[in-house]
């Protein structure tokens, strides 16, 4: 069984305020089954940005078609970026259970927000 890896290829992404940010995440295996979630920050204060199993998340869309049964691309686009969105974003695989439990995290992508060009 191939061990699941979570690949966040970009260490950092810089976006102008008002633009959209694309945060890339791919997984190398579908197993164990369970949802992908995105968070800003780490630890107890982290903020849920996207959860594959529930929604909607009005400013967040998935870049690829996640309803494909073999999909392994969980990149997201966040629209209308503001300075409050700055931080490190983690793509995390959960393993199914009651409740689902965190299985593996990507290394994180730091989002910085530039001033809106005048």
């Amino acid at each position: 069984e191939e061990e699941l890896q979570i690949i966040q290829p970009d260490k950092s992404v810089s976006v102008a305020a008002g633009e959209s940010a694309i945060l890339h995440c791919t997984i190398t295996s579908l197993f164990p089954v369970g949802p992908i979630q995105w968070f800003r920050g780490a630890g107890p204060a982290r903020v849920l940005i996207y959860n594959q199993r529930q929604g909607p998340f009005p400013r967040v869309t998935t870049v690829s078609e996640t309803t494909k049964r073999e999909n392994m691309d969980f990149s997201i686009s966040i629209s209308n970026i503001t300075p409050a969105d700055a931080g490190t974003y983690y793509c995390i695989k959960f393993r199914k259970g009651s409740p689902d439990t965190e299985f593996k995290s990507g290394a994180g992508t730091e989002l910085s927000v530039r001033a809106k060009p005048s």
Epitope: E65, T67, K68, R69
Partner: antibody, heavy 118, light 107 residues
């Protein structure tokens, strides 16, 4: 309220074709994968085919692969099942079902009866 | 193939458990579907192993561990008489499979 309404069933002869439709309402159809499930007289439920939300990927049980084609038209909120080379074994009630994020089912239509008889 | 008992029976108020075996916990999610008469529309009572739709009474619950899933009806009622089908989605094959169904009789 989520509603799924199948149509297109009827009586056909062996070897003939039939196209089933499923009209969806009450949810954002283009965001959900969909499936067809059938039930032969006196038998249990049998999953036949599923299709991703955008329609680019389809999946089939072996027994209908090559004879049945699942498709969708998101502009019309409609799901289809094209059935060719029908045999008596295809006699059943055919249901369309909305898929959950992990390809189980949450909502079902009332079904349409297909009878294959000479 | 998913295996479930052909029939179970219970008195009103009792707890009923219906098991479904044959899946792989590592790669399979389970759902449970109620059909009150042949040819009538199935109703989803549990999906994603243990998630109950908002319009389903709280007496229905689901769980999964190892290679089996369980549907539990706590305080069964006469109106729960039906055939219950388990289904699995296997992420290895991309295929959905149904069990043969369990007929619940409430005495």
């Amino acid at each position: 309220d989520v509603q799924l309404v199948e149509s297109g069933g009827g009586v056909v002869r062996p070897g003939e074709s039939l196209r089933l439709s499923c009209a969806a309402s009450g949810f954002t159809f283009s965001s959900y994968a969909m499936s067809w499930v059938r039930q032969a007289p006196g038998k249990g439920l049998e999953w036949l085919a599923g299709i991703s939300a955008g329609g680019s990927d389809a999946y089939y049980i072996d027994s209908v692969k090559g004879r049945f084609t699942i498709s969708r038209d998101n502009s019309k909120n409609s799901l289809y099942l094209q059935m060719n080379s029908l045999t008596a074994e295809d006699t059943a009630v055919y249901y369309c079902a909305r898929e959950t994020w992990n390809h189980l089912f949450d909502y079902w239509g009332l079904g349409t009866l297909v009878t294959v008889s000479s | 193939a998913l295996t479930q008992p052909a029939s179970v029976s219970a008195n009103p108020g009792e707890t009923v458990k219906i098991t479904c075996s044959g899946g792989d916990w590592y790669s399979t999610y389970y759902g449970w579907y109620q059909q009150k008469s042949p040819g009538s529309a199935p109703v989803t009572v549990i999906h994603s192993d243990d998630k109950r739709p908002s319009d389903i009474p709280s007496r229905f619950s689901g769980s999964a561990s190892g290679s089996a899933a369980t549907l539990t009806i706590t305080g069964v009622r006469v109106e729960d008489e039906a055939v219950y089908y388990c289904a699995g989605y296997d992420g290895r094959t991309y295929i959905n499979t149904f069990g043969a169904g369990t007929t619940l009789t409430v005495l």
